[in-house]
């Protein structure tokens, strides 16, 4: 509309008692330069006088009359574009409508701006993303609809009352579109942050508390589990029983399914929080864990290494190398599955016990023909003695001896 003056400024400005207000403002008059400017508080039009009545906070006229409020209120504008204002300090009773009465040579205009001054510093507002998931970086935003050049403030982030270590980025806006102070914090929440209180605290330049906003974190996370085993050391003997219990220490949202895994493979028909293993065999040794799922995904407990102890199995002998040439070296190795590992070995040559040989390996540095024959062994651990296996044959090759001519 060409019959109107054009103004741009925030619709409402917010402040509190004792602070200040900075009003960014631009205008375009219909014709010529500004000749007179009056700032009213709660102006009312008087039809009888065809003038505005109200408290005059600021006056700039040709005759140079200046109201007493002039020291507190400053017009920082000019005659054709800028109508920026500052009130410092601002008082509770400044709340209401500010009226900018502008007059050029031939035209007049009253522009209204709302001012909301509270008794105490009002709280900032924390903005969270719609969903927070563990270990996924999010940006927490703290917004305060206030900024003023004459009144420095700071926004500080606290987690459970303790300042957060992450670096926050604070920005201010003092434009005709918006006036605010904003602090943004990048944060990778862990599952343990679920339910914790985050605070954005408004402080003055000296760090004195002015106001705050708090939110409770809702961190979506996979179930967090604890596995307990009886016996606690997870060492049993064949035929014993074992009980494993899975406890959910935290889940958000609630868990839906439970399963057990052995060596990474799911155990069939084991879908409760207790795993009972009766009369265990050595094949049941391995790494066990429980897996509980929710809408976020599956959570796994730490692994429990179940050791099923048993006496040594029948031994086998490995010979390095047979056949062997007389004078060469040979090594025998006694192999037997056992838990715990065998502590003692008994060696046999052609069925006769080799005295003093109790190690897993037997080394012959210089083979002679008489070493030839069958070697077998027996392994022993704390649970018993194994059986002698079939043994291995050592063949010793040697040159002719005692050559006789016929």
């Amino acid at each position: 509309d060409s019959s109107k003056w054009v103004f741009e400024h925030p619709e409402t400005l917010y402040a509190w008692e004792g602070a200040c207000v900075w009003i960014p403002c631009t205008y375009r008059a219909l014709d010529g330069d500004l000749e007179s400017f009056i700032l009213f508080h709660n102006p009312e039009y008087n039809k009888n006088t065809s003038k505005f009545d109200g408290t005059r906070l600021y006056e700039s006229t040709k005759d140079g009359k200046v109201p007493s409020e002039q020291k507190r209120v400053q017009f920082l504008g000019d005659k054709n574009k800028n109508c920026t204002l500052s009130i410092h300090p601002v008082h509770l009773n400044d709340s209401g409508q500010l009226g900018l009465r502008m007059e050029s040579k031939t035209e007049k205009w009253m522009e209204r701006i709302h001012l909301n001054v509270s008794e105490r510093p009002f709280p900032p507002h924390i903005q969270l993303p719609p969903e927070i998931q563990e270990s996924q970086e999010v940006t927490l935003t703290c917004l305060l609809n206030f900024s003023c050049y004459g009144y420095p403030i700071q926004l500080q982030w606290l987690l459970e009352g303790v300042p957060m270590r992450q670096a926050a980025v604070t920005s201010t806006s003092l434009t005709i579109k918006s006036v605010f102070t904003r602090s943004e914090l990048k944060f990778s929440p862990q599952w343990s942050h679920h339910g914790k209180i985050v605070t954005c605290q408004l402080q003055d330049a000296d760090g004195k508390f002015l106001s705050n906003d708090t939110v409770q974190l809702n961190v979506k996370h996979t179930p967090k589990l604890e596995i307990k085993v009886t016996p606690s050391d997870a060492i049993v003997r064949e035929g014993d029983s074992v009980t494993m219990t899975c406890e959910v220490s935290s889940s958000n949202p609630e868990y839906t399914t439970v399963s057990w895994l052995k060596d990474g493979t799911s155990l069939k028909k084991q879908n409760t929080f207790t795993l009972n293993l009766r009369e265990v065999t050595k094949d049941q040794s391995g790494k066990y864990c429980c897996q509980v799922s929710n809408d976020v995904g599956p959570g796994r407990s730490e692994e429990v290494f179940l050791q099923v102890q048993y006496a040594p199995e029948p031994s086998t002998v490995q010979i390095l190398h047979s056949p062997a040439v007389e004078g060469s070296q040979v090594e025998f190795l006694c192999m037997s599955l056992a838990n715990p590992l065998p502590t003692n070995y008994t060696w046999y040559h052609n069925g006769k016990e080799m005295q003093g040989r109790t190690e897993e390996k037997v080394h012959i540095p210089k083979i002679l023909p008489w070493h030839a024959g069958t070697y077998s062994c027996v392994a022993e651990n704390i649970l018993g003695t194994g059986q002698r296996g079939p043994g291995a044959e050592l063949d010793v090759q040697y040159p002719p001896k005692k050559v006789t001519t016929v």
Epitope: W347, H349, K352, M354, Q355, G356, I364, P365, L368
Partner: nanobody, 122 residues
Framework: QVQLVESGGGLVQAGGSLRLSCAAS????????MGWFRQAPGQERRFVAG????????VYADSVKGRFTLSRDNAKNTVHLQMNSLKPEDTAVYYC???????????????WGQGTQVTVSS
Amino acid sequence: QVQLVESGGGLVQAGGSLRLSCAASGRASGSGAMGWFRQAPGQERRFVAGIEWSSGGPVYADSVKGRFTLSRDNAKNTVHLQMNSLKPEDTAVYYCAAAPWVFSSPDDYMYWGQGTQVTVSS
């Protein structure tokens, strides 16, 4: 081709000491094991101690443990049986024998020395 020669036997008073030696020559030396046996009149040969040439420590019969010490001298192909705190029941003919391993039965030894007499008087 294997010869075993014992030495060091004799008469000694109870509580005294003797050192028996066995020198090996031929194919039995340097690889395999040497054993000492004893045979009292009217009794069978019994294992006393044994040791391998290449490695491992000596093996003793329970009756001599703590009193007898068996050692080897690979350079001279000789084994020594140091006998301390001798008792009258140690009286016997002492034989050294060779086998691929230390066995407790005399049947498993292939070569034998001629024996040396040890007499312990009370």
